[in-house]
């Protein structure tokens, strides 16, 4: 009491840092600070962060929450977790699309957009991999079609119709002229 | 809106004796350290002492230790600064200010003169 | 303690000028560095603490950078207002102590 020297940082636990005058414990995930401790080794006041802020961290020095990103939805994105005081919004794609990262070295904080996953149904094609963090990988034709040149082409149902050689191997028909 | 309200000062011999006070509202005033700064006529400032929140904690300049003594009253929102054997050189503007790593909010002083 | 050497102890200048002060700290004081302005008859009031972090409601044109010693206070564009006493403190560590000011007048 009565004395002029901060005191070092020498308070119990490793939490404490200096602020000012004073070592001060600082302000857990999802807080901000108010003011610093006023008294060696004492608590920070902390104030909860306001609705769309957050704080990811403990920390001693932010005197305001980051503001929560919003989901772009020029870019068809949607959030998948919504923001919470001590994580930010985390944003994708609804199912059915993928993540078309918007520069080449990608990383989880890189700018994207969604794009609709291949229907490979639709395509008459076996889907080999599901549509996830990238598009539909699909794979052979169908039962029914065979491959004619970028796609998988019906059986014909005839024998009016002429089946080449790679018909005639999946539909079991002969060429026919 | 933060208020800070000095009250007290006036004249007085040398050896005399002064209690001022400051009102604090707009504020939790329980959160906040708080400090007597004073400033001599035409001259700069000069940090006097310092509270913690609670109380429980004091520092003094080595210009007015073992004189003044500086204390708070939470229920009441106020700060106090007793001086005791009071010199010349303790003639000042005194304004009290409310800490947050600066003094972000300040008084507007109460004046102590010191004179025989 | 701590001594706050601040430089220069008075100025003239011209509305529009650009109006630097520096603070240099006889010791290491991170950026515990507060700037105030204090018109005549009047309390000081925080312009910027931390050393460079401008207090809401302050105008743009004041600003404040350095760290450890040395520090520096500008005003990009001196106006009539402006006029006052300016002084730093350091808050690092007690005894608290402000430099001795600087008085800005007008030419």
């Known amino acids: 009491q009565g004395g002029t020297r901060s005191p070092r940082c020498d308070c119990a636990g490793d939490f404490h840092k200096k602020i000012g005058l004073f070592c001060c414990r600082g302000c857990p995930a999802g807080h901000y600070l108010k003011a610093p401790c006023t008294e060696p080794c004492g608590n920070s006041t902390c104030l909860v962060c306001p609705q769309d802020t957050f704080l990811a961290w403990e920390n001693h020095h932010n005197s305001e929450c980051a503001r929560c990103q919003a989901c772009d939805e020029q870019a068809s994105q949607v959030a998948l977790e919504n923001c919470s005081a001590v994580a930010d919004t985390r944003c994708g794609c609804k199912p059915g699309w993928f993540v078309e990262c918007q520069v080449s070295q990608c990383v989880s904080s890189s700018p994207f957009y969604c794009q609709p996953c291949l229907d490979c149904g639709a395509l008459h094609r076996h889907t080999r991999l599901l549509c996830s963090r990238r598009d539909t990988d699909c794979g052979t034709c169908l039962p029914g079609f065979y491959e004619h040149g970028d796609g998988c082409v019906s059986c014909p149902t005839s024998t009016l119709g002429s089946c080449p050689e790679r018909c005639a191997a999946v539909c079991g028909w002969r060429q026919m002229f | 809106e933060v208020q800070l309200v000095e009250s007290g000062g006036g004249s007085v011999q040398p050896g005399g004796s002064l209690r001022l006070s400051c009102a604090a509202s707009?504020?939790?005033?329980?959160?906040?350290?708080m400090s007597w700064i004073r400033q001599a006529p035409g001259k700069g400032l000069e940090w006097v002492s310092y509270?913690?929140?609670?109380?429980?904690?004091?520092y003094y300049a080595d210009s007015v230790k073992g004189r003044f003594t500086i204390s708070r009253d939470n229920a009441k929102n106020s700060l106090y600064l007793q001086m005791n054997s009071l010199r010349a050189e303790d003639t000042a503007v005194y304004y009290c200010?409310?800490?947050?790593?600066?003094?972000?909010?300040w008084g507007q002083g109460t004046l102590v003169t010191v004179s025989s | 303690d701590i001594v706050m050497t601040q430089s220069p102890s008075s100025l003239s200048a011209s509305v529009g000028d650009r109006v630097t002060i520096t603070c240099q700290a006889s010791?290491?004081?991170?950026?515990?560095l507060s700037w105030y302005q204090q018109k005549p008859g009047k309390a000081p009031k925080l312009l910027i603490n931390?050393?460079?972090n401008l207090e809401t409601g302050v105008p743009s044109r004041f600003s404040g950078s350095g760290s450890g010693t040395d520090f520096t206070f500008t005003i990009s564009s001196l106006q009539p207002e402006d006029i006052a006493t300016y002084y730093c403190?350091?808050?690092?560590?007690?005894?608290?102590?402000f430099g001795q000011g600087t008085r800005l007048e007008i030419k």
């Open positions: 200010a409310r800490y947050s790593g600066a003094f972000d909010h």
């Open positions: 707009g504020f939790t005033f329980s959160s906040y350290g």
């Open positions: 509270i913690s929140s609670s109380g429980g904690h004091t």
């Open positions: 010791q290491d004081i991170s950026n515990y």
């Open positions: 931390d050393a460079s």
């Open positions: 403190q350091q808050y690092d560590n007690l005894p608290i102590t």
